[in-house]
Amino acid sequence: EPPTACREKQYLINSQCCSLCQPGQKLVSDCTEFTETECLPCGESEFLDTWNRETRCHQHKYCDPNLGLRVQQKGTSETDTICTCEEGWHCTSEACESCVLHRSCSPGFGVKQIATGVSDTICEPCPVGFFSNVSSAFEKCHPWTSCETKDLVVQQAGTNKTDVVCGPQDRLRDPGGGGGRLVPRGFGTGDP
């Protein structure tokens, strides 16, 4: 009875289990009842990094100097080339497909340390009481406005991305002659 599953490093084809090609090699022909899987090494500037049945190897990544990229680690038949950025520049992602002078801190984050020639911008989340509403490579988190010091009240709470909104004190004088004490509307006035 033909197999329905194969062992590790094998694949099922034409009701039989064939060996996968090892990393660094591509498939030329599947095995048969009488022959083993035929594999060939990848060419120069090509690679395959897994046990596979690929008929084509992948091209090594090109580190484009026009994008500020240079080779950090040359590729082999089993590994891709690893790119990095020119000195003083920073990769935009783990894949390092382009370079920026320095990254910015998004809204809700402030700059903890400005970028240097060797290290990129270091961001930190804005703690309670602070906010940042911009993307920046130099601005820290700003403290929420203190409404009290302006003789105002908080109308809308602040977040890590927005400042508080202050507004006038919505209050009435106490009609009971309470020495000019300010009483919130609807309190102590007999209003429902």
Epitope: N66, G68, C85, S98
Partner: nanobody, 116 residues
Framework: EVQLLESGGGLVQPGGSLRLSCAAS???????EMWWVRQAPGKGLERVS?????????YYADSVKGRFTISRDNSKNTLYLQMNSLRAEDTAVYHC?????????WGQGTLVTVSN
Amino acid sequence: EVQLLESGGGLVQPGGSLRLSCAASGFTFRDYEMWWVRQAPGKGLERVSAINPQGTRTYYADSVKGRFTISRDNSKNTLYLQMNSLRAEDTAVYHCAKLPMFFEDWGQGTLVTVSN
């Protein structure tokens, strides 16, 4: 295509002044944080100064605080760096940069030489 064209560099004596300009095109200048970055001969990049899109907040490296002033004119799409009390160690190529600044948009810069 982003273009940043720096000008205003030159040879100046220690203690002298220069005003650098950066004419920007290919992007909405008023929406971007802008930077001045310099590179002294044989040295790495040094971030000198920055300004927010509205021109209301600025940053200065300790090495230039009190001597340099960054400003911008959003109506003219131009960034400025006023440099006073110049020192020999300010000698460098000065580049303006937007945020984010991609390598391919990096300009030639303008050379400032401070020497007797």
